[in-house]
């Protein structure tokens, strides 16, 4: 069964810009990836980007760019005002959903401040599985 990982990385030189990286470990056919966040604007879940293997990518503010990093991982870059960034991100959780075949949907979420840039193994804060 594939394992989804998520990491959130602040840019060292620019506190208003950061990236969400997520991927799936192991052997699975990816048909769709959705990156979203919770607690950023309101209590609901906000869709940041959708990445389709063939049809391309779509992103919504504050996401600035979404792209595939490898055949089984993606990256979404977000940009916002510095004051808003500091206040809004404290309670924000970022989630990545991978729709794969034949395993179905796999979701992993990560709080911004629980991400360790030097992490060498996937340790999702939350791993929801819905087949």
């Amino acid at each position: 069964s594939p394992e989804v990982w998520v990491q959130v990385q602040m840019e060292a030189t620019n506190l208003s810009s950061f990236s969400v990286h997520c991927g799936v470990l192991g052997y699975s056919l990816i048909s769709l990836v959705t990156v979203s966040c919770e607690g950023f604007v309101d209590a609901g879940r906000t869709k940041l980007a959708v990445l389709h293997p063939e049809f391309g990518t779509q992103q919504w503010a504050p996401a600035r760019q979404a792209h595939w990093e490898t055949p089984n991982s993606v990256s979404v870059t977000l940009t916002m005002g510095q004051s808003k960034a500091r206040s809004s991100l404290a309670n924000t959780t970022f989630c990545c959903e991978f729709v794969t075949f034949p395993h179905g949907s796999r979701v992993a979420c990560r709080d911004l401040h629980r991400s360790d840039p030097g992490l060498s193994a996937p340790t999702p804060a939350l791993n929801l599985q819905a087949d």
Partner: antibody, heavy 123, light 106 residues
Amino acid sequence: QVQLVQSGAEVKKPGSSVKVSCKASGGTFSSAAISWVRQAPGQGLEWMGNIIPIVGIANYAQKFQGRVTITADESTSTAYMELSSLRSEDTAVYYCARDTGRGYTRHFWFDPWGQGTLVTVSS
Amino acid sequence: DIQMTQSPSSLSASVGDRVTITCRASQSISSYLNWYQQKPGKAPKLLIYAASSLQSGVPSRFSGSGSGTDFTLTISSLQPEDFATYYCQQSDILYTFGGGTKVEIK
């Protein structure tokens, strides 16, 4: 234009480990994955695994799971591949290559490649 | 794992010949297929990516086609520098290479 330069040839004893390095120059290192591919003498190409340097997370081919460790050091723009419990069948040229793609679709290919590192396993 | 089967494993041809190499995937891989050329003692060189896109700097006599499970690399007029081994590679689920096709001088 990114260039990948690998460490020199190694001779190892069965049961030991080898660590091969791959240094990138002339472009951004952390934003693209680095794959490792091996080729035994007279044989075909075999993908071993890859790593995304910016997050340090590696994906491995099932065949090498548990025996290979791929790491990256962003500060030196260098990727490493360590293979343990070496046996004679591991004698091969080991290549690193950059996972290159357009980004907006899931199409990826290997370009450029390192020059290769010959690892000989012999008692 | 996805298996990639290349045929033929070797072929003999003359300069000026039209050469066709086929690659078959064990399951559909859409157009996630790349072709490489390798000469003895050298690293592989990318020729074709995404089944049919010619890599920058590669001569136009090389072309790729196919989707799903069946793919073809064609060299329209073989040149002396084209004698080498050719590999296909799928990038749909992780990566797998075909066994290679050695193109030799007749």
